[in-house]
Interface confidence: low
C-alpha cells in the first residue's frame, strides 16, 4: 500500500521536511503532489511525468519544494503555514490512480528564555521568592533546573502558572544556587542563562580560632573570628567587656599574664540587622626555662661503660620526656629511666648509641625541647681488612695495599712484612716487586683512646707462575630442583683470566648456568641430577696457566616413583613370590613394604615362599630419601590362583 512518511513529523520553522514515499508502484506514468487531504488542481504543488522527466510546478508551488525521482517531496525553509496534510497522486502506466496522504506539524524555534524574580535579596527564614520564565510561549513546556539538576522534591518549592513560575517559600541559605529555566516544544529546547539567588542570612554564632585557650608569656596572641553571614559580617572585639577594635582579627604581641581574661567577638549583619557574639577565656602562663642535658661520661668506651644523661633543671611537678634520633625511646633492656624520668641511663654503650638525644619539659601548654646531645662512643679497632683481596702478583708490578679498621677515634696503622715493622701508614706501596717480596704482610690497627690493637695477616706470593687453583663450593650436597650451587675458583689473582670446564668440555650454554665475579664464580641454579659432573676451573695470565683438580657435584635427588619387578600380577598357588623394588635416588633410599596396608619388612626385596590364594591383595613399596626429605610409593595387585585352574600363570621364581 502506498504510504507517506514525514521526516521529521514535527518540523521547525526555517528547516526542511521530507515527505518520503513508501511502496511506490512500478511502471508509473507520473505523479503529483497536492496541499491538503485530497486531489485539488488549485492546490497542486508539483507534477512529474516519468517518460519526459518533466517536472511542472502547480498553483501551490512555492519554489521551496524539490521532487525526487522516487516521488518523495522535500520542502525547504518551512513556514508555519506549511503545517497540515499533503496528498500524493500517482498515475500508473495503466493510468490507474493511487493516492496517499501524509502530514507534518510546524513549530517555531523557541527564543532563549530569561528568568525574572520578584525579590532580588530575600532574607532567610522570612521571605519567599517567585521566579518566572520569560517569555510566555504557546504550546511550550516549561522546566526548571537547580545547579543543573532537576528540581528536588520539597514542600518549600512550588510550580504554578503552567510550570512557568517557580516559588521558593521561606528561603534558606541552601537555596543560594544557580537557577535556570528551559522552554521546550517538539522541535526545540532552549535554556536560560543561570540566575544566582542571593539569600541574605546570619550572622550565625561566630567561631573564634585558634581553639587553644592557653598561652605562654612572651608569645603573640592572634585571634580570628568568623561567622557565616550574607553579606559578610562586620566584627568587633571586646576584652573583659571593654571594646578593643572593629576588625575580624585581634592581634596582641608579646603577651603577659595580665592579658588573661574573657575575649568576646561580636558579628553584625547590616542587611538583616542581626548581632551574634561568642566568648573565649584566654589564660597566659609564665615561661618555664629551656631544658638542657648533662652527662656523667662524655667519652664512654663501647661494651665497657654506662652513661647517665640527666635533664636539667629539676622542677617540681614537671613531666620529663626523652627522644633518641627524633623518636620516642625504644624498648630496650639497656635503656633505664629514673622514677621521675629525669635521668636516662644507657648500660654498656655501643657505637650505635651516639644519638642525638633530646629531653623535654612538659607544661600546661606545650613541650620545651633541649638542644640535642651526641655521645662520643669510643670503640674499636675492629679486625682490619686489607684490600685488594689478591694474593698472587706477577713480578714487575706495583704492590699497593690499603688497610681499614672501624674505630673511634680513627685507628693508627702499622705494616709488618714477615714480622718486621715497615711503616706507620694506612697504605703500603712497593713498586716493581720481585719474588723476594713474597711473604706475610701484617696490618696492625691501634686505638689510642681505648689502647686496643687488632691485626690482620695476608700472604702475598710474587711469582710468574700461577699456583694450582682449587674450587670452593657454597653447598656440598644440593637438592635437585631446589638448591643453587656457587663454585668459586681460588685464589683471587691480579690480571688473571678464569676458565671453567664440565666433564672436560667448555661450559654449555644454559639459562641455569651463570658466570660472575670476573668469571671466578660459576653458579648453577635449580640443580638437577644431570649436573652431577666433574667441574674444573683454570687460571691463566700472559705467562702461565693452571687447572684445578676436578670437583664432582653430589646432587641429592629422588626418590623417583619406584618400579616393582617382575611385572607379573598373576601367580599359581605354591609358587614363591619374589618382588624387588627399585627407585632412582641419591643417596639410596630406604625401602619398606606393605601388604593390604599392613607394614612388612624394611628391605628392597620381598620374598614369600609357597604362596596361596590367601596372599591375594595389594603390595605397596614405599621409598624414602632422608637427605632430600622426600618420599614415594607404588602399589601392585597380586592374584594367586589354585593350581591348574588358569592357564598362563607364573610358576614363580
Amino acid at each position: 500500500k502506498l504510504t507517506i512518511e514525514s521526516t521529521p513529523f514535527n518540523v521547525a520553522e526555517g528547516k526542511e521536511v521530507l515527505l518520503l514515499v513508501h511502496n511506490l508502484p512500478q511502471h508509473l506514468f507520473g505523479y503529483s503532489w497536492y496541499k491538503g487531504e485530497r486531489v485539488d488542481g488549485n492546490r497542486q504543488i508539483i507534477g512529474y511525468v516519468i517518460g519526459t522527466q518533466q517536472a511542472t510546478p502547480g498553483p501551490a508551488y512555492s519554489g521551496r519544494e524539490i521532487i525526487y525521482p522516487n516521488a518523495s517531496l522535500l520542502i525547504q525553509n518551512i513556514i508555519q503555514n506549511d503545517t497540515g496534510f499533503y496528498t500524493l497522486h500517482v498515475i500508473k502506466s495503466d493510468l490507474v490512480n493511487e493516492e496517499a496522504t501524509g502530514q507534518f506539524r510546524v513549530y517555531p524555534e523557541l527564543p532563549k528564555p530569561s528568568i525574572s524574580s520578584n525579590n532580588s535579596k530575600p532574607v532567610e527564614d522570612k521571605d519567599a521568592v517567585a521566579f518566572t520564565c520569560e517569555p510566555e510561549t504557546q504550546d511550550a513546556t516549561y522546566l526548571w533546573w537547580v545547579n543543573n539538576q532537576s528540581l528536588p522534591v520539597s514542600p518549600r518549592l512550588q510550580l504554578s502558572n503552567g510550570n512557568r513560575t517557580l516559588t521558593l517559600f521561606n528561603v534558606t541559605r541552601n537555596d543560594t544556587a544557580s537557577y535556570k529555566c528551559e522552554t521546550q516544544n517538539p522541535v526545540s529546547a532552549r535554556r536560560s542563562d543561570s540566575v544566582i539567588l542571593n539569600v541574605l542570612y546570619g550572622p550565625d554564632a561566630p567561631t573564634i580560632s585558634p581553639l587553644n585557650t592557653s598561652y605562654r608569656s612572651g608569645e603573640n596572641l592572634n585571634l580570628s573570628c568568623h561567622a557565616a553571614s550574607n553579606p559578610p559580617a562586620q566584627y568587633s572585639w571586646f576584652v573583659n567587656g571593654t571594646f578593643q577594635q572593629s576588625t575580624q582579627e585581634l592581634f596582641i604581641p608579646n603577651i603577659t599574664v595580665n592579658n588573661s581574661g574573657s575575649y568576646t567577638c561580636q558579628a553584625h549583619n547590616s542587611d538583616t540587622g542581626l548581632n551574634r557574639t561568642t566568648v573565649t577565656t584566654i589564660t597566659v602562663y609564665a615561661e618555664p626555662p629551656k631544658p638542657f642535658i648533662t652527662s656523667n661520661n662524655s667519652n664512654p668506651v663501647e661494651d665497657e661503660d654506662a652513661v647517665a644523661l640527666t635533664c636539667e633543671p629539676e622542677i617540681q611537678n614537671t613531666t620529663y620526656l626523652w627522644w633518641v634520633n627524633n623518636q620516642s625511646l625504644p624498648v630496650s633492656p639497656r635503656l633505664q629511666l629514673s622514677n621521675d624520668n629525669r635521668t636516662l641511663t644507657l648500660l654498656s654503650v655501643t657505637r650505635n648509641d651516639v644519638g642525638p638525644y633530646e629531653c623535654g619539659i612538659q607544661n600546661e601548654l606545650s613541650v620545651d625541647h633541649s638542644d640535642p646531645v651526641i655521645l662520643n662512643v669510643l670503640y674499636g679497632p675492629d679486625d682490619p681488612t686489607i684490600s685488594p683481596s689478591y694474593t698472587y702478583y706477577r713480578p714487575g708490578v706495583n704492590l699497593s695495599l690499603s688497610c681499614h679498621a672501624a674505630s673511634n677515634p680513627p685507628a693508627q696503622y702499622s705494616w709488618l712484612i714477615d714480622g718486621n715493622i715497615q711503616q706507620h701508614t694506612q697504605e703500603l706501596f712497593i713498586s716493581n716487586i720481585t719474588e723476594k717480596n713474597s711473604g706475610l704482610y701484617t696490618c696492625q690497627a691501634n686505638n689510642s683512646a681505648s689502647g686496643h690493637s687488632r691485626t690482620t695477616v695476608k700472604t702475598i706470593t710474587v711469582s710468574a707462575e700461577l699456583p694450582k687453583p682449587s674450587i670452593s663450593s657454597n653447598n656440598s650436597k644440593p637438592v635437585e630442583d631446589k638448591d643453587a650451587v656457587a663454585f668459586t675458583c681460588e685464589p683471587e689473582a691480579q690480571n688473571t683470566t678464569y676458565l671453567w670446564w664440565v666433564n672436560g668440555q667448555s661450559l654449555p650454554v644454559s639459562p641455569r648456568l651463570q658466570l660472575s665475579n670476573g668469571n671466578r664464580t660459576l653458579t648453577l641454579f635449580n640443580v638437577t641430577r644431570n649436573d652431577a659432573r666433574a667441574y674444573v676451573c683454570g687460571i691463566q695470565n700472559s705467562v702461565s696457566a693452571n687447572r684445578s683438580d676436578p670437583v664432582t657435584l653430589d646432587v641429592l635427588y629422588g626418590p623417583d616413583t619406584p618400579i616393582i619387578s617382575p611385572p607379573d600380577s598373576s601367580y599359581l598357588s605354591g609358587a614363591n613370590l619374589n618382588l624387588s623394588c627399585h627407585s632412582a635416588s641419591n643417596p639410596s633410599p630406604q625401602y619398606s613394604w606393605r601388604i593390604n596396608g599392613i607394614p612388612q619388612q624394611h628391605t628392597q626385596v620381598l620374598f614369600i615362599a609357597k604362596i596361596t590364594p590367601n596372599n591375594n591383595g595389594t603390595y605397596a613399596c614405599f621409598v624414602s630419601n632422608l637427605a632430600t626429605g622426600r618420599n614415594n610409593s607404588i602399589v601392585k595387585s597380586i592374584t594367586v590362583s589354585a593350581s591348574g585352574t588358569s592357564p598362563g600363570l607364573s610358576a614363580g621364581a
Partner: antibody, heavy 121, light 106 residues
Framework: EVQLLESGGGLVQPGGSLRLSCAAS????????MGWVRQAPGKGLEWVSS????????SYADSVKGRFTISRDNSKNTLYLQMNSLRAEDTAVYYC??????????????WGQGTLVTVSS | DIQMTQSPSSLSASVGDRVTITCRAS??????LNWYQQKPGKAPKLLIY???SLQSGVPSRFSGSGSGTDFTLTISSLQPEDFATYYC????????FGQGTKLEIK
C-alpha cells in the same frame, strides 16, 4: 571511486552506424539514472539522451530522436548508445554521464573522459 | 523547447576579482538549473545544482542564485585554477545547456 569508461568511438562514413559503450564502477549502477552528452569540436555541450534506472523511461534530444537508441545492461554495469544513420553534424566527443538519484532536479555529478566519434567520408 | 542564454560569452578578469555569470531561460524553470565548469581537453565538472546547492568538494567561493528565468553564478575571489569555460543547464526536458562563458586571464 566512481569511474566511467567510454569505448566504441572512431571514424565512420555518413549513414553508417556505431555503438558506444560505457563501463561503470564504484557505485550502484542499477539504481542510477545515466545519460550521454556530446561536444562538437570547439562548441558547447549538448545533451543527447538519458535512461531511467530500470530502462522503463528514456528521453532523447530532438536532433537524434529516431536515429539513436540508449540502453543499459545492469548485470554488466554497462550503458550503451546505438547510433544509426550518422551525419557529419554528429561528429563530437561523446561523454557518458551519471545522474544521482537524489536530490532532484537532474544533474550530472560524474562524467567519463569522452570518446571521439568522427563522421566523415 | 526551453532555450538557455548565457552572458557574457567571454570575460577577462584578474586573480582576486569577483566574477558574475548570468543565465536566462526562455520560460520559467523554477530552480531546475545546474552550473558546470570545463577546462580544455577535460570533461565538465559539476559546481552548483538546483540553482544554489553547492556540490560536495567544490570551494565555497562558488555560489549560485536565482529562480524562475534568471540565474547567476558568482565567484567571490577568482583563483588561478578558476580560468575555464562555464555552462548552465536547465534540468527540465530536454536538458539543454547554455552556449557557455569563457573566463580568461586579463
Amino acid at each position: 571511486e566512481v569511474q566511467l569508461l567510454e569505448s566504441g568511438g572512431g571514424l565512420v562514413q555518413p549513414g553508417g552506424s556505431l555503438r558506444l559503450s560505457c563501463a561503470a564502477s564504484g557505485f550502484t549502477f542499477s539504481s542510477s539514472y545515466m545519460g550521454w552528452v556530446r561536444q562538437a569540436p570547439g562548441k558547447g555541450l549538448e545533451w543527447v539522451s538519458s535512461i531511467g534506472s530500470g530502462s522503463y523511461s528514456t528521453s532523447y534530444a530532438d536532433s537524434v530522436k529516431g536515429r539513436f537508441t540508449i540502453s543499459r545492461d545492469n548485470s554488466k554495469n554497462t550503458l550503451y548508445l546505438q547510433m544509426n544513420s550518422l551525419r557529419a553534424e554528429d561528429t563530437a566527443v561523446y561523454y557518458c554521464a551519471r545522474y544521482p538519484s537524489v536530490p532532484f532536479p537532474p544533474h550530472v555529478d560524474y562524467w567519463g573522459q569522452g570518446t571521439l566519434v568522427t563522421v566523415s567520408s | 523547447d526551453i532555450q538557455m542564454t548565457q552572458s557574457p560569452s567571454s570575460l577577462s578578469a584578474s586573480v582576486g576579482d569577483r566574477v558574475t555569470i548570468t543565465c536566462r531561460a526562455s520560460q520559467s524553470i523554477s530552480s531546475y538549473l545546474n552550473w558546470y565548469q570545463q577546462k580544455p581537453g577535460k570533461a565538465p565538472k559539476l559546481l552548483i545544482y538546483a540553482a544554489s546547492s553547492l556540490q560536495s568538494g567544490v570551494p565555497s567561493r562558488f555560489s549560485g542564485s536565482g529562480s524562475g528565468t534568471d540565474f547567476t553564478l558568482t565567484i567571490s575571489s577568482l583563483q588561478p585554477e578558476d580560468f575555464a569555460t562555464y555552462y548552465c543547464q536547465q534540468a527540465g526536458n530536454p536538458h539543454t545547456f547554455g552556449q557557455g562563458t569563457k573566463l580568461e586571464i586579463k
